[in-house]
Every structure is written in structure tokens, then in C-alpha cells.
Amino acid sequence: EQAPGTAPCSRGSSWSADLDKCMACASCRARPHSDFCLGCAAAPPAPFRL
């Protein structure tokens, strides 16, 4: 987990200010409104699951 302003999050993850850590972009399929998903825009959209 990275602190903001230091090294970026690893590939496939994005910084969450809400959670204060890097989060996996893969989780944006289930939780597309998470703050860090804005940083995952390069990933193609996937269907939301129940």
C-alpha cells in the first residue's frame, strides 16, 4: 500500500482517498462508484454483478 504523493499504486490498482490505500481496479466491477475507480478508467467496463 502506497502513501499518496510517493510511488504510484501497482499496475491494476488505484489510490483510494476514502480508504487511504491502493485498491484493486478489479473490484470496480462490483463497486463502480468507489472513489478509486476514477483512476481505473483505462480498464474496459464490465457488467455489474448482483
Partner: antibody, heavy 119, light 111 residues
Framework: QVQLQQSGGGLVQPGGSMKLSCIAS????????MSWVRQSPEKGLEWVAE??????????HYAESVKGKFTISRDDSKSRFFLQMNNLRAEDTGIYYC??????????WGQGTDLTVSS | DIVMTQTPASLAVSLGQRATISCRAS??????????MHWYQQKPGQPPKLLIK???SLESGVPARFSGSGSGTDFTLNIHPVEEDDTATYYC?????????FGGGTKLEIK
């Protein structure tokens, strides 16, 4: 340090009720989805129920085998959540774990609590 | 429901060798980008512990001896080189849809 501390469980007669509790600390509880997972020699690991966060309208989901019998709930102000189990049967016997997930995988786990349904 | 089939049910591997555990889902659990498959280790008397998420992403603090691969319906957990401490039961789990389901487990013994 993340902790999920469970309470409840024990011996209950068929048709009886039991409430399990889980108190969380060390992470942003209100942002996480919470689940109960049970384990038995017969069925292995089995996801039971999930309650999502406020931003997901506290949506709840249940395994087909417990729908109408079990109720999951949470109290974000006290970082705790619950599983109310009614009309218990022998097949509900097992170790019950509380677990947190942001999405997809079960990240943090409680220590587990035994439930035995027997007369 | 998606059925997760793990093989073998048990295996014995010599210290320092490679352990390979397979998990097959009854339908695809992958998008073009990510696979919604996760692996756990469980030791007697303890809850499961997350090892690998999204098929191949190592959880923080997990030794690099553990690796995961696969997509679609077929996934693999590799442990190399195995150590004494790896004696445990390993489970796969999908999060493609509700209900989330687990594999039946693979019990690993170190020779």
C-alpha cells in the same frame, strides 16, 4: 491491526434460534461489505449471507439454503454486525466465520464460532 | 450456481519441490481484463487466510513462493519451493456472481 471478534454459538435444539455477533476494529468498517461463511465436514466452506455498505443501501444477499431463516444486519456506529438464525436444523451445524470484503474476496476473518444443532 | 471443482483432493510433495493445485469453474469467471477467482490457505483450528486474489495477484505479506494463474474456467495455484509450514488445506473461491462458492479443498502434506 485488523480484528474481527465473534461471539454467540453453542448448542441449540432443532427448531431453535441463535444470534451471532461480530465486532470489527482496525479498518474502515462502514465502507466494507460483511459476510458470514460457515464450514462443515459435509459441505466444506459455504458462503451464507452478505450485507453491503450504506453506499449500496445496505443490500442483503443470502444463500438459497438459509433464505427466510437467517437475517444479517449491521450497526456501523458500533462497527458490528449480526446473524440471526431461526428454525435451525441439523444441517446448519458447523463453524461460522464472520468476514469482511471490500468486493469479491474475503479479506479479514473472525476466529470462528461453533454452532451445534442437536436434540 | 457456479460449481468449483478442485483437484487433487490431497497431495504429498517433498520439501523444496513444487505443489500444483487446480480449480475448475462450471462457467467462466473472467472478463477480458480480470478473473474473479481467489485462493485461501487454512490450517487446523484457524480461519482461512487469503493468499491470491483475482487469479494471480499476491496478497500483501504472502511469500512469493505462492503464485496463481489461469482464466476463464481453469485456474492453478502453485507453491514452489514448498516448505514445512505450507502443510494446510487450500481452497479456491469465485466472486463472479451470488452465491459465492468455494472449491472442496486440497489437503497438502509435505514429505
Amino acid at each position: 491491526q485488523v480484528q474481527l471478534q465473534q461471539s454467540g454459538g453453542g448448542l441449540v435444539q432443532p427448531g431453535g434460534s441463535m444470534k451471532l455477533s461480530c465486532i470489527a476494529s482496525g479498518f474502515t468498517f462502514s465502507s466494507y461489505w460483511m459476510s458470514w461463511v460457515r464450514q462443515s465436514p459435509e459441505k466444506g466452506l459455504e458462503w451464507v449471507a452478505e450485507i453491503r455498505s450504506k453506499s449500496d443501501n445496505y443490500a442483503t444477499h443470502y444463500a438459497e439454503s438459509v433464505k427466510g431463516k437467517f437475517t444479517i444486519s449491521r450497526d456501523d456506529s458500533k462497527s458490528r454486525f449480526f446473524l440471526q438464525m431461526n428454525n435451525l436444523r441439523a444441517e446448519d451445524t458447523g463453524i461460522y466465520y464472520c468476514s469482511s470484503t471490500y468486493a469479491d474476496y474475503f479479506h479479514y476473518w473472525g476466529q470462528g464460532t461453533d454452532l451445534t444443532v442437536s436434540s | 450456481d457456479i460449481v468449483m471443482t478442485q483437484t487433487p483432493a490431497s497431495l504429498a510433495v517433498s520439501l523444496g519441490q513444487r505443489a500444483t493445485i487446480s480449480c475448475r469453474a462450471s462457467q467462466s469467471v473472467s472478463t477480458s481484463t480480470y478473473s474473479y477467482m481467489h485462493w485461501y490457505q487454512q490450517k487446523p483450528g484457524q480461519p482461512p487466510k487469503l493468499l491470491i486474489k483475482y487469479a494471480s495477484s499476491l496478497e500483501s505479506g504472502v511469500p512469493a513462493r505462492f503464485s496463481g494463474s489461469g482464466s476463464g474456467t481453469d485456474f492453478t495455484l502453485n507453491i514452489h519451493p514448498v516448505e514445512e509450514d505450507d502443510t494446510a488445506t487450500y481452497y479456491c473461491q469465485h466472486s463472479w456472481e451470488i452465491p459465492y462458492t468455494f472449491g472442496g479443498g486440497t489437503k497438502l502434506e509435505i514429505k
